[in-house]
Interface confidence: medium
């Protein structure tokens, strides 16, 4: 399946062009031919590089959308694919670079004064809208854009892996996304589920370090789907 | 060291106000979501509020839903919550928190009792 | 308004391991593997101990251990010590109104 491209999320330590998805190691990245990707769990050229498989956008990094590689393909077959730059056709938001939105099917940049991207909407519907207005208005992010001086420690926010310090990785937390450890063996881990099951992915895990993955806790076998835990694991 | 001193609290009637502050250091306070957690004597944890890191985003429990305010200002680490109409259920120690992963740091707290 | 549920106390003598557990729903614990734990002794501001279910802060001794099964999650304490008699909470994220949510408490003592 799809799927078994994830049995394996070990990365560690992405330089900081490669540090964009938070939490999705095995995400594309918009780059040079050539460049390393962080695909199928290991640094891979663009010519073996393993698309990462998705059912939502939300599964993808910050520059990344979910959709079929194919204009017209299998609708269940579905790998994140590099964002769409200003004045490039669009059919959402989503499909449109950071600061950019989908405006009469044409990626337009964005009016921050009237424009919110996608995912805050539905965090907003999640959530309530309770008194609240949601930080930030570029696609997948509820931070504004920041000069990160120094590293960020762990808890910190971030806006991608890069702005993290050694050892950690951004991915989302409640509301906002924060620095936050990448596992080590036996902790719980976030096997990506297709839709259908529970809702937004509103909190994060960083991925497994290096030589493990995220696979069925052993003596889970037995509980039901919906409350199987995964722990990081060695190969 | 991750370093949080509320103050502010105090005696106060039944439908009155009171202003609690939270002075942050040793850490880069503007970088920090922010959350008031609350327990009532006896009692166990109750979250009220949390505000972003750059306050364009607050979130209330229902509870304090529409007399509770959450703010801050960076530029003097300082983290605030504006009590109105204040009840006798009200009366707890308030602690600011950092969110950071989950309540990582905490104050000690300062206690607000509502009475007559 | 305790959402999670927690036994009011707990005991155990020095050196043995204990349990904690914490019981919610599909809506909160059940629905999201983030649960969190919490010591508080008398008087103190709680410190946390365990988050993203199993995961320990740096500086919190590893006899504290987390799990989680269905809408159940657990805080183990093995080599019982007398400092670890306190209150234990729980915490969690929940869909709805109510973002985070707090078991009621336990309160563990450390016999003899």
């Known amino acids: 399946t799809l799927n078994s491209v994830l049995n394996s999320n070990a990365i560690k330590n992405l330089p900081p062009p490669l540090g964009g998805a938070a939490g999705h190691p095995g995400s594309a990245v918009s780059a040079a031919p050539g460049i390393l990707y962080p695909g199928g769990n290991k640094y891979q050229t663009i010519d073996n590089y393993q698309p990462y498989p998705c059912a939502e956008d939300e599964e993808c990094g910050t520059d990344e959308y979910c959709a079929s590689p194919t204009r017209g393909g299998d609708a269940g077959v579905q790998i994140c694919l590099a964002c769409r730059k200003r004045r490039k056709r669009c059919m959402r938001h989503a499909m449109c670079c950071p600061g950019n939105y989908c405006k009469n099917g044409i990626c337009v940049s964005s009016d921050q004064n009237n424009f919110r991207g996608e995912i805050e909407e539905t965090i907003t519907e999640s959530f309530g809208n309770d008194h609240s207005t949601l930080d930030g208005y570029s696609r997948r992010t509820t931070l504004s854009s920041k000069m990160y001086h120094s590293k960020g420690q762990e808890g910190s926010v971030c806006l991608r892996s890069s702005d993290c310090a050694t050892g950690l990785c951004c991915a989302r937390h409640f509301w906002s996304k924060i620095c936050k450890p990448v596992l080590k063996e036996g902790q719980v881990c976030t096997k990506h589920r297709r839709k259908g099951s529970h809702g937004l992915e509103i909190f994060q895990r960083c991925y497994c370090g290096e030589g493990l993955s995220c696979r069925i806790q052993k003596d889970h076998h037995q509980a039901s789907n919906s409350s199987r835990l995964h722990t990081c694991q060695r190969h | 060291q991750v370093q949080l001193v509320e103050s502010g609290g105090g005696l106060v009637q039944p439908g009155g106000s009171l202003r609690l502050s939270c002075a942050a250091s040793g850490f880069t306070f503007s970088s920090y979501w922010m959350s008031w957690v609350r327990q009532a004597p006896g009692k166990g944890l109750e979250w009220v509020s949390v505000i972003s890191s750059d306050s364009s985003s607050t979130y209330y429990a229902d509870s304090v839903k529409g007399r509770f305010t959450i703010s801050r200002d960076n530029s003097k680490n300082t983290l605030y919550l504006q009590m109105n109409s204040l009840r006798a259920e009200d009366t707890a120690v308030y602690y600011c928190a950092r969110h950071g992963i989950d309540f990582d740091h905490w104050g000690q707290g300062t206690l607000v009792t509502v009475s007559s | 308004d305790i959402a999670l549920t927690q036994p009011a106390s707990v005991s155990g003598s020095p050196g043995q391991s204990i349990t904690i557990s914490c019981t919610g729903t599909?809506?909160?614990?059940?629905?999201?593997?983030?649960v969190s734990w919490y010591q508080q002794h008398p008087g103190k501001a709680p410190k946390l101990m365990i988050y993203?279910?199993?995961n320990r802060p740096s500086g919190v001794s590893n006899r504290f251990s987390g799990s989680k099964s269905g809408n159940t999650a657990s805080l183990t304490i093995s080599g019982l010590q007398a400092e670890d008699e306190a209150d234990y909470y729980c915490q969690s994220y929940a869909s709805g109104n109510t973002k985070v949510v707090f078991g009621g408490g336990t309160k563990l003592t450390v016999l003899g």
């Open positions: 599909s809506s909160d614990l059940g629905g999201y593997n983030y």
């Open positions: 993203d279910v199993n």
